[in-house]
């Protein structure tokens, strides 16, 4: 009788081990499914958002005419600011006209107030000429007011409604600019 009981007990224990194994496999399978589902949903979401997102500018960028602008919330030196903008497929702001300058300064007033923002303007060390990052010269009304007596490289920044100059190694906010997407409709 005792032998019979112990045989049954062993069989039950074996069954229990098998069930535990099955449960473990099931849990693992369920987790794998959930993970795959998550990836699948993320992929679908990205595909859908890029398909529907025909907005001319990315989220948190401001549009004006053919341009999108991003006003940074972090400080960096001029060169790092340029790097950051490039990472977003943009460049530091290049102001082409008084109208654009007015739009930028008006937007800054609404967003943040009177802070310093790097733009894509730098002074050539040899000639002393001011040039935009694409090599073009600023229009006469858009030359920085002389303020920096620095022996180091000098770069341009916007503050309130003025264009000013400073040592490129100082820390400031910055503004990135990219072309707005044209509507394909």
């Amino acid at each position: 009788k005792l032998l019979q009981v112990s045989t049954i007990a062993m069989q039950q224990q074996e069954k229990l081990i098998q069930q535990e194994r099955a449960l473990l496999n099931f849990t693992e399978w369920k987790r794998s499914c959930a993970l795959q589902m998550k990836y699948c949903q993320a992929f679908m979401q990205n595909s859908l958002s890029s398909a529907h997102n025909s907005s001319p500018c990315p989220n948190n960028w401001i549009q004006n005419r053919e341009s999108c602008y991003y006003v940074s919330e972090i400080w960096s030196i001029w060169h790092t600011s340029q790097e950051n903008c490039l990472k977003e497929g943009s460049t530091l702001l290049q102001i082409e006209s008084k109208e654009e300058m007015d739009f930028i300064t008006g937007s800054l007033r609404k967003i943040k107030g009177s802070y310093d923002y790097w733009v894509g303007l730098s002074q050539d060390g040899h000639s002393g000429r001011w040039l935009w990052q694409d090599g073009s010269s600023p229009s006469p009304g858009l030359l920085p007011a002389e303020r920096s007596q620095s022996a180091n490289q000098v770069c341009g920044y916007v503050k309130s409604n003025s264009l000013l100059s400073s040592n490129c190694s100082t820390w400031k906010y910055f503004i990135c600019e990219k072309y707005a997407l044209r509507s394909s409709v």
Epitope: K87, G89, Y179
Partner: nanobody, 121 residues
């Protein structure tokens, strides 16, 4: 992942010109900007020129007026032409690609192996 293959370096006479090219393969649809950096002996690596996916360009003060960067989107290739070369242009030139990210300023940088440019008579 993005793989980069550079070509076009070598020995150039002062006053001469050079054309570097860099072909990107892999996840090339995720590229936000392509460009060229250089590193002279004992100096830091510096940006020479870059071009964004939208076609905006950037030049360092050292090549403004002498350099031209262009991009063939169909071939995923970026070209850098520099004229009126000076001995100061001697450096290793590296191709760079910046990729998109869901996080602002969080994109990855990919680098080529570099191509030596020596300006000497």
């Amino acid at each position: 992942q993005v793989q980069l293959v550079e070509s076009g370096g070598g020995l150039v006479q002062p006053g001469g010109s050079l054309r570097l090219s860099c072909a990107a393969s892999g996840s090339s649809d995720s590229i936000n900007a392509m460009g060229w950096y250089r590193q002279a002996p004992g100096k830091e690596r510096e940006l020479v020129a870059a071009i964004t996916s939208g076609g905006r360009v950037v030049y360092s003060d050292s090549v403004k007026g002498r350099g031209t960067i262009s991009r063939d989107n169909a071939k995923n290739t970026v070209y850098l032409q520099i004229a009126s070369l000076k001995p100061e242009d001697t450096a290793v030139y590296y191709c760079n690609v910046k990729t998109k990210s869901a996080v602002l300023f969080g994109g990855m940088d990919y680098w080529g192996k570099g191509t030596q440019v020596t300006v000497s008579s």
